[in-house]
Structures are given as structure tokens and as C-alpha cells.
């Protein structure tokens, strides 16, 4: 993984044992018409490849041009390849669309490593396995890029689902989801179920597999077990949340909770790893090493660089601890925790050893821009981005990878005081530089 860039992300699909279906809690809030229930046409509409992103099929222009688009909750531009590129099988051809409108404005997006640039316009957009609507949306037509598109990833663009504040070139460029909600009756909410396979997949397996679901405008009960627990969206830019406590195998890291959110904590489907601020990462790795001390691994493994292999089917999951993040709850002084397994934070890697081995990379890494709850976290859970009520919900995913001894969990409530103090207030002057860094 190139930790300097948020992309590529990892998926991994299908084949995961289903989580045990737990009885529904009785204190769940009442059904809201159009927001909950069954969204059969949208279930299983995501595909992807380990480390390279979950994508949805979209159509752009008239007549419609079909493209696979990476689902990214960590950015806010809808941007698609619009010129030939060695890694693209197809691209958006504006000249073939009768509904394309040029905004006569350029856009440039640098990452820590890599960049893309393009020309802004609008066109008609729809999601075949989504709501039955067509919207006119802003599109960045990518004409030049460096280390952005990924060879073999099978996606040709990116759908930034975060808020206008972080859109490029500025917050006046309305993001796709805002346009969708404004122009249709689709409720202001979407939910994601990212399904990690627990084992690497080759290209043909990816194309034939299900990678998860993006439910636009609602919540599908079949995609999760137990209850949904909600944490407030602290500020509408990234999907920013507040972590109030971290435990490794039930042992509190005992850090000032501000450290967990320094300089922010976000939920980001466009990042592979669980990324932690330097101090938190060091404490977490120390604790994970101690918990798994019956076996030792090289430093390069803990840095996410080297991969470790075991005989197929003998990965010692039991020696690796569970990791719990406590998130601020909706009620004063109340929190809940989400718990992931090593099956989430050890990422299967393909094509390196022999077929007789299962090989993994450590998918927790260091960050200089705060905590990023990437695929490592999201693959354990069904995540509801309830923009209308400014909150994010977590429930145990029906497709998460686990074993017979442990399962991912979402549990609460817990009493936690002074949670507001856990948030870090970014000095106003720093923001512009922080947003271009994306480290």
C-alpha cells in the first residue's frame, strides 16, 4: 500500500461466512418511509479488487456511456477518466454526449504522491443498480493524471461522496450526492456494505464476485445483524467522527482521547487501511505485538511493507487481538464500541508466495492527518451515512469475515464523560494545506 495516497483501496469479495443473525433489538427507532426496508435492486451493486477499490457502475451522458466508478467517502468530486490512459479500458467521451455542458473551468487535485487534473462540466448521470433517476451533475473530466488510475483495478473514475467543503477547486462545486438529493426525491442518506473476502482474488474472480452494496437513499435490513448505533458527524466536510477510547483485546490504550482524533477522525471508503496518528499507531502496535508475542514478525511487517505467510488454512488468527474503537454516541455521556478482528486488519495479498500459503500485510498504518477508518474498519460493518440527521451508523455486517471463536461487534451503551474534549480543533490557517496533503 502506498500510504501517502488514500487510493488504492482494498476490497476482496465473496466467500465470507455470514455473521450469525442476531435477534433484532426492540429499542430500534420506528421505520421511516423511504429510508428503511428492502432495496433489492441495489444489493450487491459493488465490485472490487483487493487493495484497489470498491466500484459501482454508473452511466454518463446521452446516449449513456457506462463506466465503473470508485466509491469514495473521503473526497467530494465526481471525476472520470476522459482521455486515453494505459490503465483505462474505456473513458468518458464528452464529444459523444449531446447533454454535456462545459463549465470552462479547470481543476487540479494533488495528492502526497500523485495527482489528477481535468476540465469541469456537467452532464446527465445515473446509477443502473441504484435509484431509478437521472441527475445533472458536475463532472471533472480527467485529462491528465499521475499515480491515480490503477492497472487492473477495473474502475475509470471516482465518486466523492463527502461534503462540498472539500470539493475542488472550491466548495461552490456541488458534489454528486447533493445534486441527487436536490433534483430527486431520494432521501439524504446512503449506506455501504463492503465485503472483504478474507482471501485474495484474481481478476476473473473479482469480475464474477460481489463486493458489497451501496444503498442510495436508505438502509437494507438484510445487510446487517443486531442494532445500528449512531455517532454524530462532527463537521460536514469529510465524514468526521470522534473516537473516545481505544482498546486492544479489551486493554485500554490509556491515551488522552484528543490523540485519537489528532487532527481529525474520518470514515473513508477510499482508503485501504485503518490509519492512526503517529503516537496512537505506536501504542497500538506495541500492544498488538505484546498480544501476539508467541510469534515474532519483522519490523517491515508492522510497517505494512513485508508480508507474512502461513500454510494455507493455518493462519493463527487466535494470537492476534481484537481492536475496539469507542465512538461518541448520540446521547450525552454515552458511547458505543465497534470491534474488528485480525481478519479485517490483516489484508490478504495475492501472487506472492505459493498456492500452498496464505499471505497477509498488516493493514494498520501511521498517519500525519488523523485517524482514517478505511476498508479495514468498514469491511466489518454496515455503515450508514445519514446525512439528513448528521450522523453515521454502524452495525455488524452480514458479510464480514470471521471465525468460529470471534466476530466483529457493535456494542453499547457505555458511559463516557467529557467526550466533546476528545475533538481536536484544527487551526483555521492550517486547513488548506491539510486538505492538499491527503497523506
Amino acid at each position: 500500500t502506498q500510504h501517502g495516497i488514500r487510493l488504492p483501496l482494498r476490497s476482496g469479495l465473496g466467500g465470507a461466512p455470514l455473521g450469525l443473525r442476531l435477534p433484532r433489538e426492540t429499542d430500534e427507532e420506528p421505520e421511516e418511509p423511504g429510508r428503511r426496508g428492502s432495496f433489492v435492486e441495489m444489493v450487491d451493486n459493488l465490485r472490487g479488487k483487493s487493495g484497489q477499490g470498491y466500484y459501482v457502475e454508473m452511466t454518463v451522458g446521452s446516449p449513456p456511456q457506462t463506466l465503473n466508478i470508485l466509491v469514495d467517502t473521503g473526497s467530494s468530486n465526481f471525476a472520470v477518466g476522459a482521455a486515453p490512459h494505459p490503465f483505462l479500458h474505456r473513458y468518458y467521451q464528452r464529444q459523444l454526449s449531446s447533454t454535456y455542458r462545459d463549465l470552462r473551468k479547470g481543476v487540479y487535485v494533488p495528492y502526497t504522491q500523485g495527482k489528477w487534473e481535468g476540465e469541469l462540466g456537467t452532464d446527465l448521470v445515473s446509477i443502473p443498480h441504484g435509484p431509478n433517476v437521472t441527475v445533472r451533475a458536475n463532472i471533472a473530466a480527467i485529462t491528465e493524471s499521475d499515480k491515480f488510475f490503477i492497472n487492473g483495478s477495473n474502475w475509470e473514475g471516482i465518486l466523492g461522496l463527502a461534503y462540498a467543503e472539500i470539493a475542488r477547486p472550491d466548495d461552490s462545486l456541488e458534489p454528486f450526492f447533493d445534486s441527487l438529493v436536490k433534483q430527486t426525491h431520494v432521501p439524504n442518506l446512503f449506506s455501504l456494505q463492503l465485503c472483504g473476502a478474507g482471501f485474495p482474488l484474481n481478476q476473473s474472480e473479482v469480475l464474477a464476485s460481489v463486493g458489497g452494496s451501496m444503498i442510495i437513499g436508505g438502509i437494507d435490513h438484510s445487510l446487517y445483524t443486531g442494532s445500528l448505533w449512531y455517532t454524530p458527524i462532527r463537521r460536514e466536510w469529510y465524514y468526521e467522527v470522534i473516537i473516545v477510547r481505544v482498546e486492544i483485546n479489551g486493554q485500554d490504550l490509556k491515551m488522552d482521547c484528543k490523540e485519537y482524533n489528532y487532527d481529525k477522525s474520518i470514515v473513508d471508503s477510499g482508503t485501504t487501511n485503518l490509519r492512526l496518528p503517529k503516537k496512537v499507531f505506536e501504542a497500538a502496535v506495541k500492544s498488538i505485538k505484546a498480544a501476539s508475542s508467541t510469534e515474532k514478525f519483522p519490523d517491515g511487517f508492522w510497517l505494512g511493507e513485508q508480508l507474512v505467510c502461513w500454510q494455507a488454512g493455518t493462519t493463527p488468527w487466535n494470537i492476534f487481538p481484537v481492536i475496539s474503537l469507542y465512538l461518541m454516541g448520540e446521547v450525552t455521556n454515552q458511547s458505543f464500541r465497534i470491534t474488528i478482528l485480525p481478519q479485517q486488519y490483516l489484508r490478504p495479498v495475492e501472487d506472492v508466495a505459493t498456492s500452498q500459503d496464505d499471505c497477509y500485510k498488516f493493514a494498520i498504518s501511521q498517519s500525519s492527518t488523523g485517524t482514517v477508518m478505511g476498508a479495514v474498519i468498514m469491511e466489518g460493518f454496515y455503515v450508514v451515512f445519514d446525512r439528513a440527521r448528521k450522523r453515521i451508523g454502524f452495525a455488524v455486517s452480514a458479510c464480514h469475515v470471521h471465525d468460529e471463536f470471534r466476530t466483529a461487534a457493535v456494542e453499547g451503551p457505555f458511559v463516557t464523560l467529557d467526550m466533546e474534549d476528545c475533538g481536536y480543533n484544527i487551526p483555521q490557517t492550517d486547513e488548506s494545506t491539510l486538505m492538499t496533503g491527503r497523506a
Epitope: T294, E295, K296, P298, G300, E305, L307, C309
Partner: antibody, heavy 120, light 108 residues
Framework: QLQLQESGPGLVKPSETLSLTCTVS??????????WGWIRQPPGKGLEWIGN???????YYNPSLRSRVTISVDTSKNQFFLKLSSVTAADTAVYYC????????????WGRGTLVTVSS | EIVLTQSPATLSLSPGERATLSCRAS??????LAWFQQKPGQAPRLLIY???NRATGIPARFSGSGSGTDFTLTISSLEPEDFAVYYC??????????FGGGTKVEIK
């Protein structure tokens, strides 16, 4: 300073089990800083990794030999062991024991090696 | 499986000359590569680790470079005791398992 010394029979009959001992002197096999390993080299050929062991007993084996190999450790005697079953002439080689240091990555200290011939 | 290919198989040089040995990996191994020297009847000796770091006691005339898939061991000026077989090994995939086929440096 730390030294490693292989010992065991120099001749093993086909289909039998090859057994070797590596004795660590001048340091403790129970150091948390090292794995211990076996590597072999058929006459006139290259090096082949056999497997590693940590003092806790945790083992890793070469997939191509896995079905026939057992590596074990006796911390009280400061020794680790290699057993290779159902040997054939293709297992004739110089067998080396070595220390996996530099953060468990590199074989930084080797025994002199012992030639084991498989022949009836 | 990652395959390491060493070239040339044999390098014929005179003392004082510069030796350049190559090791190519079938896929990226980052900088997780070592070089070993083996003299006849002796065990291998670690020369270079992490692609470019000299092991303890190794003379400065030995240097390693490269990352990803292409690596080089350079002996700046061959001494009589440097004529031996040299092996590379990758440890990107752990535990370390793959050695190259070796390059023999012989006296011309």
C-alpha cells in the same frame, strides 16, 4: 561470541528419517531477538531454505518440504532440531543451521554445515 | 512465487577489477534483499542486508543498490579473497525463503 554447530549422522538410508541437531553456544537460544533456521545445499547447487523456529516453538516451513519436515527446540539444552522423513537421494546435501537476525529478516550467522548423504 | 534470477552465472575478472553482479526479482520485493558470499567448503556469509546496508565486518569495497525488482552488488576492486559464489535472497515475503541461483566470480 555466539556460535552454531550442526551434528548428526552423515549417512541415512532411503525412506528413513534424517535427524540433525544444532547446538547454540555463547548465547541463549531463548533470545526474543532471533529465529533459528535450517538451510541446505545439494552438492554443486544453490541454497534451499528448509524452515525456521522461534524459542516459543512457533515454526515456519518451506512449502515444498512441509509434509516431511519437523523443526523443534529444547531451550534447556540451547539446541534446535531438524527431522526430515522419507528421504531420497535428492535430499543429499550440506545442511546448515543459522540464526535469523536483523529484525528476524536475515541469516546473519551460520554453522559450518554438515554433509548428509542418502544412500543404501 | 517470487523468483530471483542472478546474472551472469559466471563472472571472470582479475584482481583489482570492478565486479557488478545483478539480481532480478519476478515482482517487487521493495528493499528487502540480502547478498551472501560463499567460498568453497564454507558456509555462506551475510554481506549486505536491506539492499544496501553492509553487515558487520564487511569491507567498504562491497556495496549494494537497487529496490523493487532490480538489485546490484558491486565489488569496487576485487581482492584475491573475493573470488567466490554470491547469492541474493529476498525477505519481502516472510519468512525468508527464496535464494537466487548464484553468480560465481572467478579469476580470469
Amino acid at each position: 561470541q555466539l556460535q552454531l554447530q550442526e551434528s548428526g549422522p552423515g549417512l541415512v538410508k532411503p525412506s528413513e528419517t534424517l535427524s540433525l541437531t544444532c547446538t547454540v553456544s555463547g548465547g541463549s537460544i531463548s533470545s526474543s531477538s532471533y529465529y533459528w533456521g535450517w538451510i541446505r545445499q545439494p552438492p554443486g547447487k544453490g541454497l534451499e531454505w528448509i524452515g525456521n523456529i522461534y524459542y516459543s516453538g512457533s515454526t515456519y516451513y518451506n512449502p515444498s518440504l512441509r509434509s516431511r519436515v519437523t523443526i523443534s527446540v529444547d531451550t534447556s539444552k540451547n539446541q534446535f532440531f531438524l527431522k526430515l522423513s522419507s528421504v531420497t537421494a535428492a535430499d543429499t546435501a550440506v545442511y546448515y543451521c543459522a540464526r535469523l537476525g536483523h529484525g528476524y529478516n536475515y541469516f546473519d550467522l551460520w554453522g559450518r554445515g554438515t554433509l548428509v548423504t542418502v544412500s543404501s | 512465487e517470487i523468483v530471483l534470477t542472478q546474472s551472469p552465472a559466471t563472472l571472470s575478472l582479475s584482481p583489482g577489477e570492478r565486479a557488478t553482479l545483478s539480481c532480478r526479482a519476478s515482482q517487487s520485493v521493495s528493499s528487502y534483499l540480502a547478498w551472501f558470499q560463499q567460498k568453497p567448503g564454507q558456509a555462506p556469509r551475510l554481506l549486505i542486508y536491506d539492499a544496501s546496508n553492509r553487515a558487520t565486518g564487511i569491507p567498504a569495497r562491497f556495496s549494494g543498490s537497487g529496490s523493487g525488482t532490480d538489485f546490484t552488488l558491486t565489488i569496487s576492486s576485487l581482492e584475491p579473497e573475493d573470488f567466490a559464489v554470491y547469492y541474493c535472497q529476498q525477505v519481502y515475503v516472510w519468512p525468508p525463503r527464496t535464494f537466487g541461483g548464484g553468480t560465481k566470480v572467478e579469476i580470469k
